[in-house]
């Protein structure tokens, strides 16, 4: 019961979270004007990975496509490019994420079969989450070195009278979506992973018949057996098996099983 | 068509205050700004302040912050531009000019001629 | 605050000539988000209210003669009146609302030589 509650939120979490990379990659507000030197603006600029828009204080707001590709920065592009291989790989991982959930059957899918979907797509999940992750943080670090390179243009080179002042910008919602976004496409990888463990049993259950010599009784237990011997101590080739009323998933248990999450 | 009627011709004494009125027509008076610009006898415009009758918010100008005062009432469609403690120096012609896109005054009201004399 | 300068501050040209005012702002009025520049000019007739005549620098308002235009970018604006005519007598100002407060240049008195 366990391993499918750990798959079922894996699932669950990882939708959200590509959900989220997918929210933040079509959002606008990647960067926005920094307010710190003038907090009532006419003009409010933001951009994002696709286009770039201004907010008057009129009420209206208007949006301008970035229609170039080459001139474009390298790191932009190099963002999108993260953000999509995320956005893909995680849809790619929900698909085959689906099909490997305990609660789904299909056809007389095996165990092993599930198990190995669970674990493609947990680390399809990873790694999407990583993507993001990475993809947001560059933009982020791009963000923070022209921040700081247009606040020394600010102090310097203000001797004429006019004031070529740059519009600083600052992190805007669709970073801190993405991050979060990408931590939770990670942690549900990371749950899908653990619930592999415990869908794929490492060693198999060999529920055939013992036969021993004549002459010596063999007491069965139900669910599975326990050979004992009347000479009660060799067992030393023999598997032992707890024949209490344990769920198919927990035919492994792991202790410290969840310390991952 | 949009349309901004203002209140007639004041005269004052100093130190004591005006109220001038703006009636807008036309238009979805809720949803815009609304500006008051004055122009002093020979000289320039100067921006007052503004008000969104939607949600009462505003801005003013640093010069005018600590007299004027904006509000609106949507019921009537009427903006309100108070100037209290009044000086010589306030004698003007005070507009009224609805704020549009592109940050523009596109239309404005005909103007209120308001004097200020001991 | 952002200033406006206008140059210059009266100006008188014959009729059918052209005309040009300047307006020199004390910062950018270039929009990073969109690549406008919100500069506006007002033509203010006597005893009138002003009327608005273009803006975003160069977008020209519904109804007003296409021998009005503006040009400039970043500091430096004209406004041009290709070939005047007689009720294009006026004071014109320029208006930044790129931010606040919103101010307005001092003006130019255009005058019929």
């Known amino acids: 019961m366990a391993v499918t509650a750990c798959q079922g939120l894996g699932f669950v979490v990882s939708l959200i979270g590509i959900a989220g990379i997918i929210a933040a990659t079509c959002m606008d507000q990647w960067s926005t004007q920094d307010l710190y030197n003038n907090p009532v603006t006419a003009v409010f600029n933001y951009q994002g990975l696709w286009r770039s828009c201004v907010r008057e204080s009129s009420g209206f707001t208007e949006c301008r496509g970035y229609f170039t590709l080459l001139g474009l920065p390298a790191m932009l592009q190099a963002v999108r490019a993260l953000m999509i291989v995320g956005i893909v790989l995680g849809a790619i991982g929900l698909l085959v994420s689906i099909f490997a959930l305990k609660c789904i059957r299909i056809g007389s899918m095996e165990d092993s079969a599930k198990a190995n979907m669970t674990l493609t797509s947990g680390i399809m999940f990873i790694v999407s989450g990583l993507c993001a992750i990475a993809g947001v943080s560059v933009f982020a670090n791009m963000l923070v070195t022209n921040f700081w390179m247009s606040t020394a243009n600010m102090y310097t080179g203000m001797g004429g009278m006019v004031q070529t002042v740059q519009t600083r910008y600052t992190f805007g919602a669709a970073l801190f979506v993405g991050w979060v976004a990408g931590g939770l496409t990670l942690i549900g990888g990371v749950m899908m992973c653990i619930a592999c463990r415990g869908l794929a049993p490492e060693e198999t259950n060999y529920k055939a018949v013992s036969y021993h010599a004549s002459g010596h009784s063999v007491a069965y237990k139900p669910g599975g057996f326990k050979a004992s011997t009347g000479f009660g101590s060799n067992t030393k080739n023999k598997k032992i098996y707890d024949g209490g009323a344990r769920t198919e998933d927990e035919v492994q248990s792991y202790p410290s099983k969840h310390d991952y999450v | 068509q949009v349309q901004l009627v203002q209140s007639g011709a004041e005269v004052k004494k100093p130190g004591s205050s005006v109220k001038v009125s703006c009636k807008a027509s036309g238009y979805a008076f809720s949803n815009y700004w609304m500006n008051w610009v004055r122009q002093a006898p020979g000289q320039g415009l100067e921006w007052m302040g503004q008000?969104?009758?939607?949600?009462?918010?505003?801005k003013y100008s640093g010069k005018f912050q600590s007299r004027v005062t904006i509000t609106a009432d949507k019921s009537t469609n009427t903006a309100y531009m108070e100037l209290s403690s009044l000086r010589s120096e306030d004698t003007a012609v005070y507009y009224c000019?609805?704020?549009?896109?592109?940050?523009?005054?596109?239309?404005w009201g005909q103007g209120t001629l308001v004097t200020v004399s001991s | 605050d952002i200033v406006l300068t206008q140059s210059p501050d009266s100006l008188a040209v014959s009729l059918g000539e052209r005309a040009t005012i300047n307006c020199k702002s004390s910062?950018?009025?270039?929009?990073?988000?969109?690549?406008?520049?919100?500069l506006t000019w007002y033509q203010q007739k006597p005893g009138q209210p002003p009327k608005l005549l273009i803006y975003?620098?160069?977008t020209r308002e519904s109804g007003v003669p296409d021998r009005f235009s503006g040009s400039g970018s970043g500091t430096d604006f004209t406004l041009t009146i290709s070939s005047l005519q007689a009720e294009d007598l006026a004071v014109y100002y320029c208006q930044q609302g790129y931010s606040y407060p919103l101010t307005f240049g001092q003006g130019t008195k255009l005058e019929i030589k």
């Open positions: 000019a609805r704020f549009y896109y592109g940050n523009v005054m596109d239309y």
């Open positions: 910062q950018t009025l270039l929009s990073g988000g969109n690549q406008k520049n919100y």
């Open positions: 975003w620098a160069s």
């Open positions: 008000i969104y009758p939607g949600s009462g918010d505003t």
